[in-house]
Interface confidence: low
């Protein structure tokens, strides 16, 4: 166990032309804070991947007030170190991401606003217990100067913080086979007790009580050789003909990774990929607590009072992500029904409804005919969010207020002439045709395709369309 410590020395414009303008001034007061993310190994993972070794946030720096006429100076920094505790062995090689954030001050809607000013990343080899290492990283026109170290927490010592020390039992010497604990010469290396029965030749341990196997050996005590001949499957049955041996339980069996971490086997052990906010060999430690203020955009932090428990950010409307760092396009969920227009006002959603609909989400279909009168005996018909009138004969228009011309549609077929009539229209048919719309031909022999014409009307006479 131990602590990674990061000391920020300065953050400001880098050398050369194109120096950035200050992000803070009398006009835009703001303050800085930093975030560090550590990952084991020399990985080139994306910035969003879990900080498996841990993460930390600095305190907020002092409010920045610029001196008129002075060149853009290094910006004022938060006090103190950024400390990332690690529960297990220090890996020796690690990747880091250091982010510089600006907190805008002033009247904000929904709390302060944050923006990322610069992000630097690197991969380093570092032995625990060594001196401070100095570094300079540039991000665009910005320059970050910092120092870092890894130190073990007693009783752990060594370059990986895996050796344990205890006070000497006698002033002159340590126990058999044990060395003095440099640089604590007055203490002795404590024996590291592996799991009982762990093979001294093929097994080893980095923590008391465990038994981890060297390559080529397996089993709970590392006493079973792994066959090099082909087996049916990596964990296939033992076969006398192939000479395969059944390997012991796989290192990921039973998933040793806590808090939703995913396990992957390595040649000598397993590796946990931890979800955001957790780290450690088995993802058992939460590196960020509510005291670090990890929730952005006014998110409410719950839990995480001590480093061994997780925190959860409850995000305000319009934000999401484990740290409320992402703005939600809430309109993409299409909350407005019936073709309503969605407006994301930041503090609330609004739906602008189409005609005929109402309600917070345009969910109410208004009675289209309520309060709508159709004139001249027309009847109202609902549909599609808009009313329409079915007009009585001789009337038209949206509200049946217009007198219709019954002949406008040329209803008389075969050259018949149309006459408007108070109760409709009358067709005067051309010779050879008959019917209300002159639609029927008169047979040459004088008979018609229709029953005999009503009394008093000859086939050529005008027919009233009722």
């Amino acid at each position: 166990a131990g602590v990674f410590e990061l000391q920020i020395h300065s953050f400001g414009p880098g050398p050369g032309p194109g120096a950035p303008r200050s992000p803070c001034s009398a006009r835009l007061p703001c303050r800085l804070f930093f975030r560090v993310c550590l990952k084991p190994g020399l990985s080139e993972e994306a910035a969003e991947s879990p900080c498996a070794l841990g993460a930390a946030l600095s305190a907020r720096g002092p409010v920045y007030t610029e001196q008129p006429g002075a060149p853009a100076p290094d910006l004022p920094l938060p006090d103190g170190l950024l400390q990332v505790p690690f529960r297990d062995a220090w890996p020796g090689t690690f990747s880091f991401i250091i982010e510089t954030w600006r907190e805008e001050l002033g009247d904000q809607i929904g709390g302060p606003a944050w923006s990322l000013l610069a992000r630097v990343a690197g991969r380093r080899r570092l032995a625990a217990g060594g001196p401070w290492a100095r570094d300079i990283q540039r991000a665009g026109a910005w320059e970050l100067r910092f120092s870092y170290r890894a130190r073990c927490e007693p009783p752990a010592v060594g370059t990986a913080c895996t050796r344990l020390c205890r006070p000497r039992s006698a002033p002159s010497r340590c126990g058999p086979g044990l060395r003095p604990c440099a640089p604590l010469e007055d203490e002795c290396e404590a024996p590291l007790v592996c799991r009982a029965g762990c093979s001294p030749e093929h097994g080893f341990c980095e923590q008391p009580g465990e038994c981890r196997c060297l390559e080529g050996w397996t089993g709970p005590l590392c006493t079973v050789p792994v066959s090099t001949s082909s087996c049916l499957s990596p964990r296939g049955p033992s076969s006398a003909t192939t000479g395969c041996l059944v390997p012991g339980p796989g290192p990921c069996d039973g998933n040793p990774c806590a808090n939703g971490g995913s396990c992957s086997e390595t040649p000598r052990s397993f590796e946990c990929t931890c979800p955001r906010g957790f780290y450690g060999l088995r993802c058992e430690v939460s590196g960020v607590t509510c005291a670090d203020g990890p929730c952005f955009n006014g998110g409410l932090c719950v839990g995480g009072a001590d480093p061994d428990s997780a925190y959860i950010c409850h995000c305000p409307p319009g934000f999401q992500g484990s740290n409320c760092e992402k703005r939600v396009d809430r309109c993409s969920l299409q909350p407005c029904r019936n073709g309503g227009l969605c407006l994301d006002l930041g503090h609330a959603l609004r739906c602008r409804c189409r005609a005929g609909f109402a309600g917070p989400r345009c969910e109410h279909d208004l009675d289209d005919c309520a309060g709508r009168a159709c004139a001249n005996g027309g009847t109202c018909v609902e549909g599609g969010g808009a009313h329409r009138c079915s007009c009585a004969l001789g009337f038209g228009g949206r509200d049946c207020r217009e007198r219709a011309d019954p002949c406008a549609a040329r209803p008389c077929a075969h050259g018949g002439r149309c006459y408007a009539h108070f109760s409709g229209l009358v067709c005067a048919c051309a010779p050879g045709y008959m019917g209300a719309r002159c639609e029927f031909p008169v047979h040459p022999d004088g008979a018609s395709a229709l029953p005999a014409a009503p009394p008093g009307l000859r086939p050529g006479d005008p027919q009233r369309y009722l």
């Epitope: 303008r21 200050s22 992000p23 803070c24 001034s25 009398a26 006009r27 835009l28 610029e66 008129p68 006429g69 002075a70 805008e104 002033g106 009247d107 904000q108 809607i109 929904g110 606003a113 923006s115 930041g346």
Partner: antibody
Framework: QVQLQQWGAGLLKPSETLSLTCAVY????????WTWIRQPPGKGLEWIGE???????NYNPSLKSRVSISVDTSKNQFSLKLSSVTAADTAVYYC?????????????WGQGTLVTVSS | AIQMTQSPSSLSASVGDRVAITCRAS??????LGWYQQKPGKAPKLLIY???SLQSGVPSRFSGSGSDTDFTLTISSLQPEDFATYYC?????????FGGGTKVEIK
């Protein structure tokens, strides 16, 4: 190409509220000051106030009691309201975009709206 | 509020002349000053920002200099399209304030 298009009522009576809106087309809405500036006929320019995409506002103290600037990031629009107008508020009103810490870099402007206050 | 005093308020010049307009701040404003050109019926146009940086697309005959309290806009060779009114603007502190303007007229 960034464009700022503004609109609003051009003729007001004394004591009414001036209301103008500026829409931003073709550019990011975050990382800028969205500003209102006015110019009385034949006179110089006067800064009214500004808002950031996150809703932080700054107003000219001479107008602060009457002015309100709001932002609608979903529509890339920001608006100006000036209450209790008098003839002294007659001016061409401009919206403009300014960068954070940019050294007076108002690089894009709206076309201007003449607002006349008359009884 | 920071007062911006611009001088002269007007000047007459001929095409090809070298013209200088000055702006003085009532207190130090670093280099947070810009120069704008305005023609009748048009919105102002940014020429110079951060006291001396030439805005993209602006002819190189325009230049700015100065810092803290005293600033100068220089037009090295006046062209016909340069006859307009010029304003300085400080955005060091609130409220932002403009100079009173300098009208450049044809002699």
């Amino acid at each position: 190409q960034v464009q700022l298009q503004q609109w609003g009522a051009g003729l007001l009576k004394p004591s009414e509220t001036l209301s103008l809106t500026c829409a931003v087309y073709g550019g990011s809405f975050s990382g800028y000051y969205w500003t209102w500036i006015r110019q009385p006929p034949g006179k110089g320019l006067e800064w009214i106030g500004e808002i950031t995409h996150s809703g932080s506002t700054n107003y000219n103290p001479s107008l602060k009691s009457r002015v309100s600037i709001s932002v609608d990031t979903s529509k890339n629009q920001f608006s100006l309201k000036l209450s209790s107008v008098t003839a002294a508020d007659t001016a061409v009103y401009y919206c403009a975009r300014g960068e954070y810490g940019s050294g007076s870099r108002f690089d894009y402007w709206g076309q201007g709206t003449l607002v006349t206050v008359s009884s | 509020a920071i007062q911006m005093t611009q001088s002269p308020s007007s000047l007459s010049a001929s095409v090809g002349d070298r013209v200088a307009i000055t702006c003085r701040a009532s207190q130090g404003i670093r280099d947070d000053l810009g120069w704008y050109q305005q023609k009748p019926g048009k919105a102002p146009k940014l020429l110079i920002y951060a006291a001396s940086s030439l805005q993209s697309g602006v002819p190189s005959r325009f230049s700015g200099s100065g810092s803290d309290t005293d600033f100068t806009l220089t037009i090295s060779s006046l062209q016909p399209e340069d006859f307009a009114t010029y304003y300085c603007l400080q955005d060091y502190d609130y409220p932002l304030t403009f100079g009173g303007g300098t009208k450049v007229e044809i002699k």
